[in-house]
C-alpha cells in the first residue's frame, strides 16, 4: 500500500478523501488558490495533524487558524491523522485564502477526511497466530532471495479421485484443504460507511497471479462456500466494507 499520496484541492470546493492511518496525505495549497490570493491560513479538527512544508522545511500548524503564510509555488501541506473516524468526512482541514487587503477570507478550500485503519496480516512465522501489523511488513520481498511470511505450496490432493493437485484448481472441496493454506486477516476500523467512490481492493500483480491463490469463506456458520477471489485470471477483489472494527479471514496457498 502507498505510504503517501497527493490530494488535489480547489478553492470554493470541498474535496473528500480517505486517509489510511500510518500514511501521509500531501496537498498543494498554491495551485488550489483563487486569483488574487496572497496569503492563506489553516484550520483543522483535533484528530488531524497538519504541517506546512516550504522548501523542505516543515512547520506544525495550530488548530486555531490565526497564523498566515505567504502563498508560494513551493508551499505544500502534509496531513496525518491519529485515529480512525467514527463518521465519514467528519474530520477536516480548511484553507482560507486572503487577498492583498488580507482582512477576510476571499475563498476557502476544504479537505474532508475519513480516517480508517487497515492492516493486512498473516501468520508470518507459521506458529498458528496471525499477528497484528508486523512492523517489518514494509521490508518483505517476494521470491527465492526474499524475506517475510512463509507461504506453503499446496501440492497434495485432499480429494484423491480428482486428477489435479490442490494448488492447480480454484476449488476447495474440504476443510482439510484449508489446513494446508496460510491464514490471512484483513483488519479494518472506521466509520459505518466510506465516502462515495471509495472501496477497499485486494490485488496481486500479473507476474504473481500464477504463484498464489486466495480463498474466502462465505457463510462461516452454515452452508459454507469457499470462494476463489485472487490468483490465475483474478487480479483484484473488492472487499465488502462493513464499518466499525472488522476482521475478514482469507486462506492463501502457494
Amino acid at each position: 500500500m502507498l505510504r503517501e499520496r497527493t490530494v488535489r484541492l480547489q478553492y470554493g470546493s470541498r474535496v473528500e478523501a480517505v486517509y489510511v492511518l500510518g500514511t501521509y496525505l500531501w496537498t498543494d495549497v498554491y495551485s488550489a488558490a483563487p486569483a488574487g490570493a496572497q496569503t492563506f491560513s489553516l484550520k483543522h479538527s483535533e484528530h488531524v495533524w497538519v504541517e506546512v512544508v516550504r522548501d523542505g522545511e516543515a512547520e506544525e500548524v495550530a488548530t486555531n487558524g490565526k497564523q498566515r503564510w505567504l502563498l508560494s509555488p513551493s508551499t505544500t501541506l502534509r496531513v496525518t491523522m491519529s485515529q480512525a473516524s467514527t463518521e465519514a468526512s467528519s474530520d477536516k482541514v480548511t484553507v482560507n485564502y486572503y487577498d492583498e487587503e488580507g482582512s477576510i477570507p476571499i475563498d476557502q478550500a476544504g479537505l474532508f477526511l475519513t480516517a480508517i485503519e487497515i492492516s493486512l496480516d498473516v501468520d508470518a512465522d507459521r506458529d498458528g497466530v496471525v499477528e497484528k501489523n508486523n512492523p517489518k511488513k514494509a521490508s518483505w520481498t517476494w521470491g527465492p532471495e526474499g524475506q517475510g511470511a512463509i507461504l506453503l505450496v499446496n501440492c497434495d490432493r485432499e480429494t484423491p479421485w480428482l486428477p489435479k493437485e490442490d494448488c492447480r484448481d480454484e476449488k476447495v472441496y474440504s476443510k482439510e484443504d484449508l489446513k494446508d493454506m496460510s491464514q490471512m486477516i484483513l483488519r479494518t476500523k472506521g466509520p459505518d460507511r466510506l465516502p462515495a467512490g471509495y472501496e477497499i481492493v485486494l490485488y496481486i500483480s500479473m507476474s504473481d497471479s500464477d504463484k498464489v491463490g486466495v480463498f474466502y469463506v462465505e457463510n462461516p456458520f452454515f452452508g459454507q462456500r469457499y470462494i476463489h477471489i485472487l490468483g490465475r485470471r483474478k487480479l483484484y477483489h473488492v472487499v465488502k466494507y462493513t464499518g466499525g472494527s472488522a476482521e475478514l479471514l482469507f486462506f492463501v496457498e502457494g
Epitope: 470554493g12 488574487g36 484550520k43 487558524g65 487577498d99 492583498e100 482582512s103 477576510i104 476571499i106 476557502q108
Partner: antibody
Framework: QVQLQQPGAELVRPGASVKLSCKAS????????MNWVKQRPGQGLEWIGM????????YYNQMFKDKATLTVDKSSSTAYMQLSRLTSEDSAVYYC??????????????WGQGTSVTVSS | QIVLTQSPAILSASLGEEITLTCSAN?????MHWYQQKSGTSPKLLIY???NLASGVPSRFSGSGSGTFYSLTLSSVEAEDAADYYC????????FGGGTKLEIK
C-alpha cells in the same frame, strides 16, 4: 428545508444593548458561516460581519467593530449578534444569512426574515 | 474596500421589455453576486459568481461582466419582477451596491 428564524422586532432604549438571535434548522449548523447584514429604512444593505459556528472564528466590517459582537450556541444551532450602546442610527432591520464557501461561489444562499430594531426613548 | 455603484437608481419598465441593470466597481472584483428583494421581505440570491442562476430562478434572468463592470439582464420583464436589486462582491471586505429599484409601468 433550510430555515433561519429571527424574532420580528425589538424595541430598545438609547444607550442600551440588544442581543439578536438567529436559529438555524434543516442543515448542519457548524458547516456554514453565518453573516449579519444591516438595512436601514429605505436604504441598501451593509455587511456587519460573519462567524464560523464550528470554532467561533469571526470577521467584522471595521465600521461595526465596536458595535457588534457575534457569538454562537452550537447546542441550539443559534447564532447571536449583540449590539451595544444603541443610538437612533442603529434603528434598522438586521438579517442573518448563511454563506457557503463551497457552493454558490460563496454567496449568501439563505436569509432570515430579519429583526426590526427600533431605538427609541 | 471596493465601492459598488449601481445604475440606474430607479428603473421603470413595461411588461415584456428587456432591461439591463449595471454595477460598476472602483477597483477590480473577482466576481459579482446579485440579490432580489421584494417589498417587506428578505433578500433572495438571484445570480452567483457573475453569471450562474441560483436554484429556482427563472431563465429570463442572466448576469455577465468582469473586472470593474457587471450587469444583470432581464430578457422579458414580468409583474412579479418588481423589486430592489443589489449587486454584492466578496474581495477584501464584502460590500453591496446601493441598489436599483425596478418598477413596472
Amino acid at each position: 428545508q433550510v430555515q433561519l428564524q429571527q424574532p420580528g422586532a425589538e424595541l430598545v432604549r438609547p444607550g442600551a444593548s440588544v442581543k439578536l438571535s438567529c436559529k438555524a434548522s434543516g442543515y448542519t449548523f457548524t458547516s456554514y458561516w453565518m453573516n449579519w447584514v444591516k438595512q436601514r429604512p429605505g436604504q441598501g444593505l451593509e455587511w456587519i460581519g460573519m462567524i464560523d459556528p464550528s470554532d467561533s472564528e469571526s470577521y467584522y466590517n471595521q465600521m461595526f467593530k465596536d458595535k457588534a459582537t457575534l457569538t454562537v450556541d452550537k447546542s441550539s444551532s443559534t447564532a447571536y449578534m449583540q449590539l451595544s450602546r444603541l443610538t437612533s442610527e442603529d434603528s434598522a432591520v438586521y438579517y442573518c444569512a448563511r454563506k457557503d464557501y463551497y457552493a454558490y461561489g460563496g454567496a449568501m444562499d439563505y436569509w432570515g426574515q430579519g429583526t426590526s430594531v427600533t431605538v427609541s426613548s | 474596500q471596493i465601492v459598488l455603484t449601481q445604475s440606474p437608481a430607479i428603473l421603470s419598465a413595461s411588461l415584456g421589455e428587456e432591461i439591463t441593470l449595471t454595477c460598476s466597481a472602483n477597483s477590480s472584483a473577482r466576481y459579482m453576486h446579485w440579490y432580489q428583494q421584494k417589498s417587506g421581505t428578505s433578500p433572495k440570491l438571484l445570480i452567483y459568481s457573475t453569471s450562474n442562476l441560483a436554484s429556482g430562478v427563472p431563465s429570463r434572468f442572466s448576469g455577465s461582466g468582469s473586472g470593474t463592470f457587471y450587469s444583470l439582464t432581464l430578457s422579458s420583464v414580468e409583474a412579479e419582477d418588481a423589486a430592489d436589486y443589489y449587486c454584492h462582491q466578496w474581495s477584501g471586505y464584502p460590500t453591496f451596491g446601493g441598489g436599483t429599484k425596478l418598477e413596472i409601468k
